[in-house]
Interface confidence: low
């Protein structure tokens, strides 16, 4: 006869590992007992269990409650055992030794590999601001056994760098994602993707990018200067900008206080019926936590009567 086993048994941390050992014997052969031991190189054999054909399962104190026989129905030639709730320390070499009648003893070895799935963590970098050079957007760390793979999934253009730290029974991998911040990246997802043989599917952690910026300010409303004449109602100036965080707006007049009746409503400056008092230089001040911008315009309220009085008929004289 001969023993059937596996060269390598792979199990995820916390799973039950089936250590196979099946004696394929000739007709009439019997298995008297199967002894399981851990036999790592450089260390003496440590007994796990003894399966006895008459007295049943014996488990050594070090493995009490953790070694069982597979559930019935059981073949009397099957010396396989279940190692419950595998931990990293279980990783190593195991040997089954089968005593048969009348063929004698057989032995076989297998290696137990315990996969430790990673629990990744994503750490955002420092606050991103438009105008910065290459900046750390986020770092992602995952530790497992064997070493996990850490990659990034994003539409954002950037560069990645990875480093690995080996520990006694695992490895930690850290990947960093660097980018040059721009306002177009605002709200874009940056996803850390961790792959590992102990995972049913990749683990993904998503970080939403926030880039601080403030656009140049401009003032709308003076496109047609002829509309700014005495008596006109509903005249207004609107300050245009955008930013992250959203900016606040403030209106002032450079050559004096704002005239009475002028209403400030956020980015808009509303005028009562226009008079020449409304002529002047108006400044829109836009600011957020990142920066501030100014834009100024000159309002010149026209007097239609003055204009008509200025008109002169040109008569040619000879």
């Amino acid at each position: 006869g001969e023993l059937e086993t596996s060269d390598v048994v792979t199990v995820v941390l916390g799973q039950d590992a089936k250590l196979p050992c099946f004696y394929r014997g000739d007709s009439g052969e019997q298995v008297g007992q199967v002894a399981w031991a851990r036999v790592d190189a450089g260390e003496g054999a440590q007994e796990l269990a003894l399966l006895h054909s008459k007295y049943g399962l014996h488990v050594s104190p070090a493995y009490e409650g953790r070694v069982e026989q597979p559930p019935p129905p059981r073949n009397p030639l099957d010396g396989s055992v279940l190692l419950r709730n595998a931990v990293q320390a279980d990783e190593g070499e195991y040997e089954c030794r089968v005593s048969t009648f009348p063929a004698g003893s057989f032995q076989a070895r297998l290696r137990l590999r315990v996969l430790v799935p990673p629990l990744p963590s994503l750490n955002p970098g420092p606050a991103l601001e438009e105008g910065q050079g290459l900046t750390l957007a986020a770092s992602c760390t995952a530790e497992g056994s064997p070493a996990p793979s850490v990659t990034w999934d994003t539409e954002v253009k950037g560069t990645t760098s990875s480093r690995s730290f080996k520990h006694s029974r695992s490895a930690a991998v850290t990947s960093e994602f660097h980018l040059v911040p721009s306002r177009s990246m605002n709200g874009q997802p940056l996803t850390c993707v961790v792959s590992h043989p102990g995972l049913l599917q990749d683990q993904r952690i998503t970080h939403i990018l926030h880039v601080s910026f403030l656009a140049e300010a401009s003032v709308r409303g003076l496109e047609d200067q002829n509309l700014w004449h005495i008596g006109r109602e509903g005249a207004m100036l609107k300050c245009l900008s955008e930013g992250q965080p959203p900016p606040s707006y403030n209106w002032t007049r450079l050559d004096g206080p704002l005239p009475s009746g002028v209403r400030v409503d956020g980015d808009t400056l509303g005028f009562p019926p226009l008079t020449t008092e409304h002529s002047g230089i108006y400044v829109c001040h836009v600011s957020n936590e990142f920066s501030s911008r100014d834009s100024q315009v000159t309002v010149d309220v026209l007097d239609p009567q003055e204009d008509s009085g200025k008109q002169v008929d040109l008569v040619s004289a000879s």
Partner: nanobody
Framework: EVQLLESGGGLVQPGGSLRLSCAAS????????MGWYRQAPGKERELVSS????????RYADSVKGRFTISRDNSKNTLYLQMNSLKPEDTAVYYC?????????????WGQGTQVTVSS
């Protein structure tokens, strides 16, 4: 087979506190991550908080951060959720779940749930 049994729900006023417990039987779960979900009427079940097998790592939904605390006592095979500063929008049936092998969603055992009602 793993069995999970939640308790500790009830009616509480806004701003009040509750402590949910989830007792596990059928298997020692100290190697497995566990979590609390909730489902409000007409809404999908959402993950509120989860904790690693050792209890060293925790995660919270944004809506409960700073108010809820997840913990576990592996010697008692029990999971807890301390809920403080409760709000009416916390009203839901709360379920505990165990993530078998700390893998992706899908390999989970669920409890039957406990009702939490926040109302004045």
């Amino acid at each position: 087979e793993v069995q999970l049994l939640e308790s500790g729900g009830g009616l509480v006023q806004p701003g009040g506190s509750l402590r949910l417990s989830c007792a596990a039987s059928g298997r020692t779960l100290s190697s497995y991550a566990m979590g609390w979900y909730r489902q409000a009427p007409g809404k999908e079940r959402e993950l509120v908080s989860s904790i690693s097998g050792s209890g060293g790592s925790t995660r919270y939904a944004d809506s409960v951060k700073g108010r809820f605390t997840i913990s576990r006592d592996n010697s008692k095979n029990t999971l807890y959720l301390q809920m403080n500063s409760l709000k009416p929008e916390d009203t839901a049936v709360y379920y505990c779940a165990v993530y078998i092998l700390e893998l992706a969603p899908g390999a989970e055992y669920w409890g039957q749930g406990t009702q939490v009602t926040v109302s004045s």
